[in-house]
Interface confidence: low
């Protein structure tokens, strides 16, 4: 007899891993035998789509290898002519073992700013993301959390979030872990120690220290007075991130002299930047009522031109007087190399006699100048070009420091040796008459400022110019 | 594929030094903690040393502290056991290996991939 | 340190049995148990992790379980390839690990 169809299992909810089988029955009962049909989502599951098979007169529906998207509802319909069509529906559940589908990757962040690990997950149930950090799970606080997407979000990156991260995703099907990712934080350069303000005498030494810190290491440039310090010695020491650098001068003038720290982010910089200032105790050059003493030269740029144990004027004013004036020399002396073979030997007369002056001693030792006649005899003879230049440079403001004030004597303040033979200091190395006069370049001026008179060889004195008369 | 290859075994005397190195490819020993285990002659498998992920972290079996150094350069991905102050007993098979995961969190994962092993004899 | 004690230490099985090998911990451990099958002259093989997980690739006639100290390593079905020597292992601490004695599977 003729029998309407009737599902005599209806279907159930089928639960899948990816990748595998999943099949839906479907068990009718009816006469004639019915033509069953099935649908994904109300859509037509054709009986060629090569991804499912359809067995037992259709009564077998199966998945051959399921896929994340065949989640849905299944429904198989029976009808064989007779009574109505009947109806079974049941769902697939695609169960998945954890998956990272965007796992996290190396990120360089500075400090304070906020860091975002990324790790979106796939699987069903629904992973729960963790996180490690070196060999230890990673704990929530106020900063750092585990957002719902699994990313990681830390706040206000701190030094010590640095480290290595990796992701895990877990559930009842599996666990699955991430590479290892690395988050450096960098740090903006910072001073730690800033140089110290100084107010010292002319001549001494001083050195400012400046520690900074920062990740990258940062790296230290002195500025003095606006331009980059090239005199003085600098040392630096690095350790546990800190860079320490000390600069050692030697002070002739007043200055500022500022610290700058620098490291860098990518394509940015970080600067830090600390200043002192240095300052001359009653600055205001050398004074005429300078103090000192009398010893012998035991230098050694001046050997040569000194006479042999000649006494000279050590002037107190210095921390170390001879240090202080032999470093004035050596400057000076440096400055030398480029002037002509004929200025060199009397420039090199004038300088040390007139640093290192020639010492009248007494209850009160006291320096005795050089005699202007000599010094012009420098200025307008030997070395006329260089004077100019050196000149034209101390009016334009191109010398560092005031050493060279140091160096070069006014002339017309040193007193003549016509006033009194014995109170101002020759030259011996200048020794020449008139006549010789022709082989030296031409004058610069028409006509001498003063006469210079035949200067007479002295092998008693040493030559010798104070501070005291020298500046402008 | 990943693979680890040990080298540098070999017959020494007691008291010398050798040192064994494990090439790693098919990932990146900064990404995973390297052990070094042992088998004497007939012998069970004994833990010797390793070293973590971070490389700021290095482990002893009290049998060789003091004695074995164990290091990593990542840019040749490669591990080393360094042995020093070698004795008749350390005489073994000395087999690298990969812990699989980060340690036992969330899970201990165990050593999934070991190398062939590198024979060490130590004899006068 | 933690002691892996391996019982028995060696056992004869033929094919199709039921063997059971079983670790017990001095002191109280995690789950940070796995177990090793090694053939000789080869190196050890990873079986089961985490106590009771099957790594990849591992026949499901191998299970492990734990019950408090004990951990147990299970072949449901022996097969003439599972003849080999088995170890437990234990990490305690991130990094230091311990093997129990071994068990070796011969056939009978």
């Known amino acids: 007899l003729p029998k309407a169809p009737v599902i005599t299992t209806p279907l159930e909810t089928v639960d899948a891993l990816v990748e595998e089988v999943a099949t839906f029955m479907c068990a009718v009962e009816s006469y004639p035998q019915p033509e069953i049909s099935w649908t994904r989502n109300k859509i037509l599951i054709k009986l060629f789509d090569t991804r499912y098979s359809i067995r037992e007169n259709g009564q077998l529906l199966t998945i051959l290898s399921v896929e994340d998207s065949d989640d849905g509802i299944y429904c198989c319909t029976a009808n064989n002519g007779v009574g109505g069509a009947v109806e079974s529906c049941g769902a697939l559940q695609v169960k998945m073992k954890p998956k990272i589908t965007r796992p996290p990757i190396n990120v360089k962040i500075i400090e304070g700013l906020k860091a975002v690990l990324p790790c979106t997950t796939m699987g069903n149930p629904k992973p729960s993301v963790s996180w490690i950090k070196g060999d230890s799970p990673l704990r929530e606080n106020s900063r750092i959390a585990v957002l719902e997407s699994g990313s990681l979000r830390i706040h206000n990156v701190q030094k010590e979030d640095a480290g290595q991260y990796r992701c895990v995703a877990k559930n009842s099907l599996g666990t699955a872990y991430s590479k290892v990712v690395k988050l450096e934080v960098e740090v903006f350069a910072r001073i730690l120690r800033a140089p110290e303000s100084h107010n010292v005498t002319f001549g001494s030494f001083v050195t400012l220290h400046c520690t900074a810190t920062g990740i990258p290491v940062p790296t230290i440039t002195w500025i003095e007075n606006g331009n980059a310090v090239s005199s003085g010695s600098i040392q630096e020491s690095v350790k546990d991130r800190v860079i320490d650098s000390r600069l050692q001068l030697f002070i002739t003038k007043p200055g500022l002299y500022t610290c700058i720290a620098t490291n860098k982010h990518g394509e940015k910089f970080s600067t830090a930047k600390a200043a002192a200032t240095i300052s001359i105790a009653e600055w205001s050059k050398p004074q005429k009522d300078n103090k000192g003493y009398c010893a012998q030269y035991r230098g050694e740029v001046c050997n040569a031109v000194l006479a042999k144990d000649a006494l000279v004027f050590l002037n107190t004013s210095y921390a170390d007087p001879e240090e202080a004036q032999e470093l004035l020399v050596h400057t000076a002396w440096n400055e030398l190399k480029v002037v002509s073979p004929v200025c060199r030997p009397a420039a090199e007369a004038l300088l040390c006699n007139h640093i290192f002056q020639e010492c009248s001693p007494g209850v009160v030792p006291t320096p005795i100048p050089i005699c202007r006649e000599y010094c012009l005899a420098v200025k307008e003879l030997f070395c006329a070009k260089e004077w100019l230049v050196m000149e034209e440079k101390t009016h334009r403001g191109l010398y560092r420091s005031e050493m060279h004030l140091l160096s070069v004597p006014e002339c017309s303040k040193l007193p003549s040796m016509h006033w009194d033979p014995t109170a101002c200091a020759r030259l011996p190395h200048l020794d020449y008459n008139k006549e010789n006069l022709k082989t030296f370049p031409p004058m610069t001026s028409s006509k001498p400022s003063v006469d210079i008179p035949n200067l007479p060889s002295s092998s008693s004195s040493s030559f010798s110019v104070s501070p005291t008369y020298s500046m402008t | 594929e990943v693979q680890l290859v040990e080298s540098g075994g070999g017959l020494v005397q007691p008291g010398g030094s050798l040192r064994l190195s494990c090439a790693a490819s098919?990932?990146?020993?900064?990404?995973?903690?390297i052990h070094w285990v042992r088998q004497a002659p007939g012998k069970g498998l004994e833990w010797v040393a390793s070293?973590?992920?971070?490389?700021?972290?290095?482990y002893y079996a009290d049998s060789v502290k003091g004695r074995f150094t164990i290091s990593a350069d990542t840019s040749k991905n490669t591990a080393y056991l360094q042995m020093n102050s070698l004795r008749a007993e350390d005489t073994a098979v000395y087999y690298c290996?990969?812990?699989?995961?980060?340690?036992?969190?969330?899970?201990?994962?165990?050593?999934?991939?070991w190398g062939q092993g590198t024979l060490v004899t130590v004899s006068s | 340190d933690i002691q892996m004690t391996q019982s028995p230490s060696s056992l004869s099985a033929s094919v199709g049995d039921r063997v059971t090998i079983t670790c017990r911990a001095s002191?109280?451990?995690?789950?940070?148990v796995a177990w090793y099958q090694q053939k000789p002259g080869k190196a050890p093989k990873l079986l089961i992790y985490s106590a009771s997980s099957l790594y990849s690739g591992v026949p499901s006639r191998f299970s492990g379980s734990r019950s408090g100290t004990d951990f147990t390593l299970t072949i449901s079905s022996l097969q003439p390839e599972d003849f080999a020597t088995y170890y437990c292992?234990?990490?305690?601490?991130?990094?230091?690990?311990?093997f129990g004695q071994g068990t070796k599977v011969e056939i009978k």
């Open positions: 292992q234990q990490s305690s601490r991130s990094s230091l690990l311990t």
């Open positions: 002191q109280s451990v995690s789950s940070a």
């Open positions: 098919g990932f990146t020993l900064y990404s995973s903690s």
């Open positions: 070293i973590s992920s971070s490389y700021s972290s290095t």
């Open positions: 290996a990969r812990l699989a995961g980060l340690y036992h969190y969330p899970g201990y994962l165990g050593l999934d991939y």
